[in-house]
């Protein structure tokens, strides 16, 4: 199995998680995309875009909003009013079949904690952006996870430094968190997805 590095993101209750998934390949432009939570070994689909996916047509399921920009190969996921029970492992996927979804990026380990008493931040509507790029060919089922990295929601006016390949990004007010991850090459990703898609088509036709 492909090794995935999960990334830990810490939030307070009431905050908003915003994830941008970068799927790049045109073949996925009109595909359904989904936001899923890993529950045990099985993923639970929380929200899906329409099929075919329409440009910037938001889909809202409860506190989750998916907005796809197929003309730019970008999917935005928002989870508002985060609660402690939202903590868990999340993934953005190309949804082809419940057991055939393709993971677009390393999973997010979301940790939501209660705001400490006396601090106004507990129900604050602050947002942390997480930018994702394709990094693995792993299926949604059964990946092996390595120890998580942690990115903590910083207090206002602070600066977070996030290391990325070949550069360092200074993030003031935690406006953006950019993760350019390349566990394998995009060419390998493309080859794997193509071969899997071919098998899938042969199976059904």
């Amino acid at each position: 199995t492909t090794e995935l590095t999960e990334e830990k993101y810490e939030y307070k209750e009431g905050q908003t998680l915003e994830v941008k998934c970068d799927y790049t390949l045109e073949k996925f432009a009109s595909s359904q995309k989904a936001w899923q939570k890993m529950e045990g070994k099985m993923p639970k689909i929380l929200a899906k875009t329409e099929r075919p996916s329409k440009n910037s047509h938001p889909v809202q399921v409860g506190r989750i909003t998916l907005e796809d920009y197929p003309d730019h190969g970008l999917l935005q996921v928002q989870m508002t009013n985060l609660q402690v029970e939202d903590s868990g492992l999340y993934q953005c996927v190309i949804y082809q079949h419940p057991k055939e979804s393709h993971v677009l990026f390393n999973p997010i380990c979301l940790v939501v904690t209660k705001g400490s008493s006396g601090t106004p931040g507990s129900s604050e509507n602050s947002t942390q952006n997480v930018y994702r790029t394709p990094s693995t060919t792993a299926k949604a089922l059964g990946p092996r996870y390595t120890s998580p990295r942690t990115v903590t929601q910083a207090p206002p006016e602070s600066t977070v430094v996030v290391s990325t390949p070949g550069s360092e990004i200074n993030l003031t007010n935690v406006t953006d968190i950019i993760r350019e991850q390349k566990l394998i090459s995009e060419e390998d990703l493309e080859q794997k997805l193509i071969s899997e898609e071919d098998l899938h088509h042969h199976h059904h036709h």
């Epitope: 790049t24 045109e26 493309e190 193509i194």
Partner: antibody
Framework: EVQLVESGGGLVQPGGSLKLSCAAS????????MHWVRQASGKGLEWVGR??????????YYAASVKGRFTISRDDSKNTAYLQMNSLKTEDTAVYYC????????????WGQGTLVTVSS | DIVLTQSPDSLAVSLGERATINCRAS??????????LHWYQQKPGQPPKLLIY???NLESGVPDRFSGSGSGTDFTLTISSLQAEDVAVYYC?????????FGQGTKLEIK
């Protein structure tokens, strides 16, 4: 290794036609949009146009300066992109590069060496 | 069409010194906070070479003295310590909207 090789350039009279080819190898050709970029001698780069993939119905887009005169096509079975140039003008004289992006509206990571088109009487 | 204007048109910098090239777009080249703005280097007789993609991401194999910054309409390419092999013409390019467009280029020379 990704390789793009342009061919078909040469001397043509104003009003004439020419068809350039771009032979691709080292990647799954059908997965990516292909672009043409040109550069007149001593001048800057000018994007000519692009052709998307089958999943995008081979949609094409062009720069205003060539629209209606140039046509981009592709043959995925031959791993080749084409640039059909009609009603050529002297200002079309340039080195024509074939380039491949890294996905939807992404950067041009791969370029051919270019082929020279000279439009002159 | 989105017009990209680079400044300066030419630049002479001493070896080891910092070189800065600017690129201004006539309208935003951002979508979803992603900047679809890229930088290329071109040497005589060669095709362009990708340096920076999406404003600030260093292309694999490109020396880390090159960096990019900016968003929306204003972008900068910086070479932290100029080397002799950096003499070239540099172009910015946007892919946020069709037609894609390039800046007019900035010629970088050694002072």
């Amino acid at each position: 290794e990704v390789q793009l090789v342009e061919s078909g350039g040469g001397l043509v009279q104003p009003g004439g036609s020419l068809k350039l080819s771009c032979a691709a190898s080292g990647f799954t050709f059908s997965t990516y949009a292909m672009h043409w970029v040109r550069q007149a001698s001593g001048k800057g780069l000018e994007w000519v146009g692009r052709i998307r993939t089958k999943s995008s119905n081979y949609a094409t887009y062009y720069a205003a300066s060539v629209k209606g005169r140039f046509t981009i096509s592709r043959d995925d079975s031959k791993n080749t992109a084409y640039l059909q140039m009609n009603s050529l003008k002297t200002e079309d004289t340039a080195v024509y590069y074939c380039t491949r992006d890294m996905g939807i509206r992404r950067q041009f990571a791969y370029w051919g060496q270019g082929t020279l088109v000279t439009v002159s009487s | 069409d989105i017009v990209l204007t680079q400044s300066p048109d030419s630049l002479a910098v001493s070896l080891g010194e910092r070189a800065t090239i600017n690129c201004r777009a006539s309208e935003s080249v951002d979508t979803f906070d992603y900047s679809f703005l890229h930088w290329y280097q071109q040497k005589p007789g060669q095709p362009p070479k990708l340096l920076i993609y999406r404003a600030s991401n260093l292309e694999s194999g490109v020396p880390d003295r090159f960096s990019g910054s900016g968003s929306g309409t204003d972008f900068t390419l910086t070479i932290s310590s100029l080397q002799a092999e950096d003499v070239a013409v540099y172009y910015c390019q946007q892919s946020n909207e069709d037609p894609y467009t390039f800046g007019q280029g900035t010629k970088l020379e050694i002072k």
